[in-house]
């Protein structure tokens, strides 16, 4: 069965500043991955980022740097100030559309005890299966 | 499919200046990164330079000081401004696009032939 998997990291040198990184774990080949926070997109999420392997990516701020790290993962660094600006309760998610397995979603946010700098282990999400 | 246009190329003397553009069909996303390539006659093609969508960029030794990549306000836009030209950078110019940055998908314009001569 396909997993997704979300970490969620604040940098230490800038507070405002987050990486959010999802890999997908299955053998499909994907197609596209869209990013959002607030919540899963298309329920009341907002995107932050899409990703086509093909085509290219688009991103919307706070987003600063959406990229490939792998054919099956990838980073986003957000950064913003006032009301930009994540906050440490901010749920990030991931969903990837992949080909056989179907669309896959994950959501994750910072670990409540991390200090600036710190990250859980990206271990898989609560798996939300989009169709 | 991404479509790449290159135009500017031409013949120009030592010394002089030319500058290349290349337009991308893509619109809507970014392309992770573009770059520019060249190949002389005889010539296996090689990297010029590169910059990334946030504006990294990448040149080669042999143009450093030269030449400048940059990408313009349209979405996509490419530009190779090069100056002091030599000889030996006769070739063609090419536009190259992989839109994700891991050579998953990889797109090339047809080319536009430079000549430095006198």
């Known amino acids: 069965t396909p997993e997704v998997w979300v970490q969620v990291r604040m940098e230490a040198t800038e507070l405002s500043s987050f990486t959010i990184r999802c890999g997908f774990l299955g053998s499909g080949s994907i197609s596209l991955v869209t990013v959002s926070w607030g919540g899963p997109n298309g329920a009341g999420g907002t995107t932050l980022a899409v990703l086509h392997p093909e085509r290219g990516i688009r991103q919307w701020a706070p987003a600063r740097q959406a990229r490939w790290e792998t054919q099956s993962s990838i980073s986003l660094i957000l950064e913003g100030s006032g009301a930009s600006s994540p906050c440490a309760n901010t749920t990030f998610c991931c969903k990837f559309a992949s080909f056989p397995e179907g669309s896959w979603e994950a959501c994750g946010s910072l670990p409540p005890s991390s200090d600036p700098g710190l990250s859980a282990p990206p271990t898989p999400a609560p798996i939300l299966r989009a169709d | 499919e991404v479509q790449l246009v290159e135009s500017g190329g031409g013949l120009v003397q030592p010394g002089g200046s030319l500058r290349l553009s290349c337009a991308a069909s893509?619109?809507?996303?970014?392309?992770?990164?573009m770059g520019w390539y060249r190949q002389a006659p005889g010539k296996d093609r090689e990297l010029v330079a590169t910059?990334?969508?946030?504006?990294?960029?990448k040149i080669v030794d042999s143009v450093k000081g030269r030449f400048t990549i940059s990408r313009g306000d349209a979405k996509n836009s490419l530009y190779l401004q090069m100056n002091s030209l030599r000889a030996e950078d006769t070739a063609v110019y090419y536009c190259?696009?992989?839109?994700?940055?891991?050579?998953?998908?990889?797109?090339w314009g047809q080319g536009t032939m430079v000549t430095v001569s006198s």
């Open positions: 893509e619109t809507y996303f970014d392309l992770y990164v």
């Open positions: 910059i990334t969508y946030t504006g990294s960029i």
């Open positions: 190259n696009a992989d839109p994700s940055g891991l050579g998953r998908k990889v797109y």
